[in-house]
Amino acid sequence: VPLSRTVRCTCISISNQPVNPRSLEKLEIIPASQFCPRVEIIATMKKKGEKRCLNPESKAIKNLLKAVSKERSKRSP
């Protein structure tokens, strides 16, 4: 990972566009920390393993998070 030694935050740009939950491999929520003073959301797509930073303040992204957590709770016993 190029920036592993120097980076404080992961995201350079953020997207307001929600991603299709079906095309999601993984959704990571990184809480604010001493290294990066903001919450970061990283979506890993099934296609080519592309990673995309999402805007935590976007209504569409908040809805996506709700949908994903609902899906997870359905699956877990």
Epitope: P2, R5, V7, C9, I12, I42, E50
Partner: antibody
Framework: QVQLVESGGGVVQPGRSLRLSCAAS????????MHWVRQAPGKGLEWVAV????????YYADSVKGRFTISRDNSKNTLYLQMNSLRAEDTAVYYC?????????????????WGQGTTVTVSS | EIVLTQSPGTLSLSPGERATLSCRAS???????LAWYQQKPGQAPRLLIY???SRATGIPDRFSGSGSGTDFTLTISRLEPEDFAVYYC??????????FGPGTKVDIK
Amino acid sequence: QVQLVESGGGVVQPGRSLRLSCAASGFTFSNYGMHWVRQAPGKGLEWVAVIDFAGINKYYADSVKGRFTISRDNSKNTLYLQMNSLRAEDTAVYYCAREGEGSNIYFFYGMDVWGQGTTVTVSS
Amino acid sequence: EIVLTQSPGTLSLSPGERATLSCRASQSVSSSYLAWYQQKPGQAPRLLIYGASSRATGIPDRFSGSGSGTDFTLTISRLEPEDFAVYYCQQYGSSPIFTFGPGTKVDIK
């Protein structure tokens, strides 16, 4: 439409300072990382500096480190490049460019929008 | 620091022909970090390809990117008159730096 417009270029003597500006319009500026890239006359492209969407992380090419400072004002939709201790080799067209949507340290979406550039000439 | 080399320096072709441009890195580069740009005289560069093989928005499908490791290729399947320009590859690497190759000029034969 999506647009970047650079300004502030001109002729300046070696050792002096200059501040470039890049006015953004047609998109949510505060969501995008921004770059400065330069091109000396008749030469190729040289990356200068990048700043993330919130202005937290800033990185520079070795050739300008300690002399140039990148900054942004999201309330004014404007990117800046403060250039100090200018040298003849800094003579170039300076472009501002937008980092692709959702770009991060794991996946580079390229520089997808560019301004038309502003010319900086360092000469005595 | 990774150095990018592009070949050939100049490619002389006719409209309708296929153009194959090479970008070689001095060390292995993740395909996630490789992009291609087109620049015409007096104009700003334009993003063509990111992630080594994904076309940017609005780029015609005659442009395609491929490759991995140290060898990457930009292919223009059938050259149109507006495709005669300089093409740059770019990689995003440690420190971080965003290095450009020296460019390949595609001109009319």
